[in-house]
Interface confidence: low
């Protein structure tokens, strides 16, 4: 639709709050270090400016398009040179040439201080004295932190957020009431924020096709009931969404989310069973309530699909006439039978299709060359179910943190340049797909498991693009999405690796130790075993669980001291040399 | 790549008709979606009437009873028939077609009511 004033359009579709919510969104996206109090300056003179476009469309400036007006405010933030350095000469550019430099300039991993949670009373205090500024301050700290977070779903949140406040801030017993919801808030926060960057990664990185692939991928297993060209106008309308959130559109993104969401409710009987009670929802919750809904059962008489792709004389004809097509419809029937597939497992199934394809139908007898394409397909089906398997085992055998443990050490040979706390987040989270796959039925633990991974995996490429080490994992992050993890997988000790110097301050800790919380006592030990297998890379499994044990007594020991701090001073070079002699 | 053309447009009289055509050119496999769109002078773009892959049709309220949207499958044509045309009908008439690949759009056919 074309409209003669875009802002008042959006600010009409979308109402006040929801406009003031986004705006704020997206700038703090872009300029992730400028004060609370500058962005709710420049939201508000926006939101004052779109109601005098929804007043009179004619009014002047009012049919500049969003980007020319946000990017014109952006521009007048005082101290934008002195901030962002380079990023101030994107505003000596014209639209679209000074977006896309904005774009450029999101940092996945700004210097900003981790968030600390203010006592219970304090933080319910702040609510009740100002309830608009406080969940403002929330929408703009996360999205400082998390550049490319899916903004419509940030409202989302943020409504989660007043609701926890307003319910536990009135409790006889407040933070047993709002701490776990504020925890499962920030987990569940962290992992939207890190799918999101996936999508956004897929879409920058490898084009809408690759995006386009994976929807229909994942919308087939979640609606195998519907069809093909259903399945094709929701795959089209979920690429429009999040290309626009991914761009920095966040007004338009939230707004076709929005009819997205409508078309599905309303179209349920062609879509799902599943969508029934997603629709009686609010549109915030309806919208997540869509995105998370389970898969429908499969249809009951789904006939086998070499028909139709192996034995078919017309294989090659259907596949020259519409190449894309002919791959998608191949890529959703096979999704839609197999919910126990990984996303990226069928994506790569359809690639090694394509390849047959490709070679097959330049041959003599195409038929002939293609009739066995299905049992190619078999060790691309085992590698993925192995991985699995052998790491639930030894997840289950070891439990999260030495799993964890064993990940660090694996992740730290193969790619000993990149940084340690890199390192350490990333294997962290990687050891986190355990405690949330292993349980699983087994027809569930693969597409947990590889498409978690992904998602873990894209946040290290996001973070090595920024501050490029390792040559091995450039080519992992950028040859193939779908191949990401099993090129990681396949990485063996860098041979060419030179061991770090032994550095005796990165083995040296103090008293403040022993009043860290459990989590981040676990980092502490972590960033030092990194730091040891980067030291010696050939060490044995058994000499670093020495070094660790080691050190664990040592932390127990001190920090049950009565003078810690010289405990500490006086165990710590003892610990040190015991490490070094071991590791010899 | 996908080209669209439409044809049939002109000038005609109030209480005229006329039968507007797209074609479709290149590999548009798939089709989920067909439709007419219009745009006024000084007017913002608007759905005239669409028809989906199992044929079900959509108008705007302006042009039920007086316009019938078809296609041909074997083809890969849309067409607009459009009986008791008013002044109002006047604009520039847009064919558009998705598929899984995309969003396809012609360039449009001009069409004019006036005594």
């Known amino acids: 639709d074309t409209h003669k004033s875009e802002v008042a359009h959006r600010f009409k579709d979308l109402g006040e709050e929801h406009f003031k919510g986004l705006v704020l969104v997206a700038f703090s996206q872009y300029l992730q270090q400028c004060p609370f109090e500058e962005h709710v300056k420049l939201v508000n003179e926006v939101t004052e400016f779109a109601k005098t476009c929804v007043a009179d469309e004619s009014a002047e400036n009012c049919d500049k398009s969003l980007h020319t007006l946000f990017g014109d405010k952006l521009c007048t933030v005082a101290t934008l040179r002195e901030t962002y350095g380079e990023m101030a000469d994107c505003c000596a550019k014209q639209e679209p040439e000074r977006n896309e430099c904005f774009l450029q300039h999101k940092d996945d991993n700004p210097n900003l201080p981790p968030l600390v949670r203010p006592e219970v009373d304090v933080m319910c205090t702040a609510f009740h004295d100002n309830e608009a500024t406080f969940l403002k301050k929330y929408l703009y700290e996360v999205a400082r932190r998390h550049p490319y977070f899916y903004a419509p779903e940030l409202l989302f949140f943020a409504a989660r957020y007043k609701a926890a406040f307003a319910e536990c801030c009135q409790a006889a017993d407040k933070a047993a009431c709002l701490l776990p919801k504020l925890d499962e808030l920030r987990d569940e926060g962290k992992a939207s924020s890190a799918k999101q960057r996936l999508k956004c990664a897929s879409l920058q990185k490898f084009g809408d096709r690759a995006f386009k692939a994976w929807a229909v991928a994942r919308l087939s297993q979640k609606f195998p009931k519907a069809e093909f060209a259903e399945v094709s106008k929701l795959v089209t309308d979920l690429t429009k969404v999040h290309t626009e959130c991914c761009h920095g559109d966040l007004l338009e993104c939230a707004d076709d989310r929005a009819d997205l969401a409508k078309y599905m409710c309303e179209n349920q009987d062609s879509i799902s069973s599943k969508l029934k009670e997603c629709c009686d929802k609010p549109l915030l919750e309806k919208s997540h309530c869509l995105a998370e809904v389970e898969n429908d059962e499969m249809p009951a008489d789904l006939p086998s699909l070499a028909a139709d792709y192996v034995e078919s004389k017309d294989v090659c004809k259907n596949y020259a006439e519409a190449k894309d097509v002919f791959l998608g419809m191949f890529l959703y029937e096979y999704a839609r039978r197999h919910p126990d597939y990984s996303v990226m497992l069928l994506l790569r199934l359809a690639k090694a299709y394509e390849a047959t394809l490709e070679k097959c139908c330049a041959a003599a007898d195409p038929h002939e060359c293609y009739a066995k394409v299905f049992d190619e397909f078999q060790p691309l089906v085992e590698e993925p179910q192995n991985l699995v398997k052998q790491n639930c085992e030894l997840f289950e055998q070891l439990g999260e943190y030495k799993f964890q443990n064993a990940l660090l050490v694996r992740y730290t040979k193969k790619v000993p340049q990149v940084s340690t706390p890199t390192l350490v987040e990333v294997s962290r989270n990687l050891g986190k797909v355990g405690a949330k796959c292993c349980k699983l039925p087994e027809a569930k633990r693969m597409p947990c498991a590889e498409d978690y991974l992904s998602v873990v995996l894209n946040r290290l490429c996001v973070l090595h693009e920024k501050t490029p080490v390792s040559e091995k994992v450039t080519k992992c992050c950028t040859e193939s999405l779908v191949n990401r993890r099993p090129c990681f997988s396949a990485l063996e000790l860098d041979e060419a690796y030179v061991p770090k110097a032994f550095n005796a301050e990165t083995f040296t800790f103090h008293a403040d130790m022993c009043t860290l919380s459990e989590k981040e006592k676990q980092v502490k030990k972590q960033t030092a075993l990194v730091e040891l297998v980067k030291h010696k890379p050939k060490a044995t499994k058994e000499q670093l669980k020495g070094v660790m044990d080691n050190f664990a007594a040592f932390v127990e020991k001190c920090c049950k001291a009565d003078d810690k701090e010289a405990c500490f001073a006086e165990e710590g070079p003892k610990f040190v040399a015991a490490s070094q002699a071991a590791l010899a | 790549q996908v080209q669209l053309v439409e044809s049939g447009g002109g000038l005609v009289q109030p209480g005229g008709s006329l039968r507007l055509s797209c074609s479709a050119s290149?590999?548009?496999?798939?089709?989920?979606?067909m439709g007419w769109y219009r745009q006024a002078p000084g007017k913002g773009l608007e759905l005239v009437a669409s028809?989906?892959?199992?044929?079900?049709?959509h108008y705007a309220d302006t042009v039920k009873g007086r316009f019938t949207i078809s296609r041909d499958n074997s083809k890969n044509m849309v067409y607009l028939q459009m009986n008791s045309l008013e002044p109002e009908d006047t604009a520039v008439y847009y064919c558009d077609i998705r598929n899984v690949g995309g969003d396809y759009w012609g360039q449009g056919t001009q069409v004019t009511v006036s005594s």
């Open positions: 028809i989906t892959v199992d044929g079900s049709t």
């Open positions: 290149g590999s548009i496999w798939g089709i989920y979606h």
